[in-house]
């Protein structure tokens, strides 16, 4: 600033007479940066951190307050200070946060509240990482809190990280929390969900498990087809292609119920496209939807496939003809 000492001079500047802060209050908003540096005691600031948030300090005044705390706690802030950081949290770097030991869910909530409505910043990601590692696992209360603030949080974790989610935590997951999950993540989450919801009755179970089905194997889809679940097309389109391919026409018809008519609109998209190509034309014709497969209508041979990612492209490129 042109009208104040340079940073190197700030610490050497004495507090003007009568300006020494006795408490953290609104009068401090009129202090220049160098006056805050000279007149506010760091220990006083630390004990009255809860007041900082209630006072509309400017961006640059908050820089000074952070600097004072950094000097007071070079090894990292204690949780009593962290809990009351408020908007000062936005000034913390991931390096600052790595020095913290945050154990209280209330502290985590308070800091996430500050960042509410914004994308997950590197600071928040670091904070969550520190918190979860400190707890040893992603328990239900933590997951509840994190997905409330960041619906996409689960899908930002690697399959390895997701493996530490206990099945009991799955109860906190809402369908929208899984919107951006890829198949590898759902492969990890699905068995946990299956375990978590295993004691529910058929229709309730399907409502809960539905958003996890992108990780379900063929045998579970076959089992669901026997339960009149009426899966919608949006859910069907998210199923693993390798899990859908072995299903018979009858099983898919039972699985989808009245939604089976939607297959026609999706016939060019995976996994419907690839599943159609694997069916006998006679069987497809029973649906009365005009779906065109490429298999003959005679003997039904089940060929073994490696369900790798190249399979769909082979089907599409070569339009494999099936022979006896």
């Amino acid at each position: 600033d042109a009208a104040q000492p340079a940073a190197s001079e700030v610490e050497k500047t004495a507090c003007p007479s009568g300006k020494k802060a006795r408490e953290i209050d609104e009068s401090l908003i009129f202090y220049k940066k160098w006056e805050l540096e000279a007149c506010v005691d760091a220990a006083l600031l630390a004990t009255q951190m809860d007041r900082v948030n209630a006072i509309p300090f400017t961006y640059e005044q908050l820089d000074v307050l952070k600097h004072k705390l950094d000097e007071l706690y070079p090894q990292g802030y204690p949780e009593s200070v962290i809990q009351h950081l408020g908007y000062l949290f936005l000034k913390m770097s991931p390096e600052d946060i790595r020095k913290w030991n945050v154990t209280s869910l209330e502290t985590l909530k308070a800091l996430l509240e500050v960042n509410k409505g914004h994308e997950m910043s590197p600071q928040v990601a670091t904070l969550i990482d520190r918190f979860v590692k400190g707890r040893g696992q992603l328990d239900k209360d933590t997951l509840d809190t994190l997905t409330a603030f960041y619906p996409g949080y689960l899908c930002s974790l690697s399959p390895e990280e997701l493996s530490s989610v206990p099945p009991s935590s799955i109860w906190a997951v809402r369908p929208q929390d899984l919107d951006t999950c890829d198949p590898r993540q759902l492969d990890v989450l699905y068995p946990k969900a299956r375990l978590a919801f295993q004691n529910m009755n058929g229709s309730e179970y399907f409502v809960k498990i539905q958003s996890f089905l992108g990780g379900a194997p063929t045998e579970d889809l076959k089992a669901l087809s026997q339960q009149n679940v009426s899966m919608d097309l949006a859910t069907f389109m998210k199923l693993r292609t390798d899990a859908v391919l072995p299903l018979t026409v009858a099983e898919v018809q039972k699985l989808l119920g009245p939604h089976v008519e939607g297959l026609k609109a999706e016939e060019r998209h995976r996994p419907v496209r690839d599943w159609i190509l694997r069916q006998r034309q006679d069987d497809l014709d029973t649906l009365g939807l005009g779906l065109q497969g490429t298999r003959g209508s005679h003997h039904h041979h089940h060929h073994e496939f490696r369900h790798d990612s190249g399979l769909n492209d082979i089907f599409e490129a070569q339009k494999i003809e099936w022979h006896e």
């Epitope: 009208a3 009129f30 006072i55 400017t58 961006y59 640059e60 005044q61 908007y87 000062l88």
Partner: antibody, heavy 122, light 107 residues
Framework: QVQLQQSGAEVKKPGASVKVSCKAS????????MHWVRQAPGQGLEWMGI????????TYAQKFQGRLTMTRDTSTSTVYMELSSLRSEDTAVYYC???????????????WGQGTLVTVSS | DIQLTQSPSTLSASVGDRVTITCRAS??????LAWYQQKPGKAPKLLIY???SLASGVPSRFSGSGSGAEFTLTISSLQPDDFATYYC?????????FGGGTKVDIK
């Protein structure tokens, strides 16, 4: 949508006091600081002070210290600005304007009341 | 207190003109500067914040630039609705202060 609805015009005698209200709606009242800004006829804008609706903390520009009082009623999401010892130069349109509670990088006024004309005349 | 000086104080222009208004601060205000538009009998309306960020719902013909002590508001092609008075405001430090205003009228 966000609305700041101010009370009607006032005519006051020199030495009297005036109390202007500003009722907020369409957002979480306690998440935004409320400021008062005035504008004398044909003149520019002048910042008067601020109230934090959450805790009731107030800060006034030095020029108005001792004459200005800001209060709030969270039950009705209303803030009040009272200016005492009025003189003719206090004739102005008084605006309430909100600023989001943030890390200091957002202290611009994103919503304003419609303004209240206060005329001080003997 | 930080003084903000706007120039020119009055500007006559025609529809379609490119208009530039300057705001100078008496000391460094970093990027903590906003611009407002005010029409007669109305409250000011936020146009630009943080020196160059366009407020929600504001047409893209408005733009802001600058940092430190010198800032500009530019209207790339003046429209009939743009004839008004424009104010800058700093929020680097308290008290918050405004420039004296620039009135844009029809040539």
């Amino acid at each position: 949508q966000v609305q700041l609805q101010q009370s009607g015009a006032e005519v006051k005698k020199p030495g009297a006091s005036v109390k202007v209200s500003c009722k907020a709606s369409g957002y979480t009242f306690t998440n935004y600081y409320m400021h008062w800004v005035r504008q004398a006829p044909g003149q520019g804008l002048e910042w008067m002070g601020i109230i934090n609706p959450s805790g009731g903390y107030t800060t006034y520009a030095q020029k108005f210290q001792g004459r200005l009082t800001m209060t709030r009623d969270t039950s009705t999401s209303t803030v009040y600005m009272e200016l005492s010892s009025l003189r003719s130069e206090d004739t102005a349109v008084y605006y309430c304007a909100r600023i989001r509670s943030c890390g200091g990088d957002c202290y611009y006024f994103d919503n304003w009341g419609q303004g209240t004309l206060v005329t001080v005349s003997s | 207190d930080i003084q903000l000086t706007q120039s020119p104080s009055t500007l006559s222009a025609s529809v379609g003109d490119r208009v530039t208004i300057t705001c100078r601060a008496s000391e460094n205000v970093n990027i903590w500067l906003a611009w407002y538009q005010q029409k007669p009998g109305k409250a000011p309306k936020l146009l630009i914040y943080k020196s160059s960020s366009l407020a929600s719902g504001v047409p893209s013909r408005f733009s802001g630039s600058g940092s430190g002590a010198e800032f500009t508001l530019t209207i790339s092609s003046l429209q009939p609705d743009d004839f008004a008075t424009y104010y800058c405001q700093q929020y680097q430090s308290y008290p918050l202060t405004f420039g004296g205003g620039t009135k844009v009228d029809i040539k």
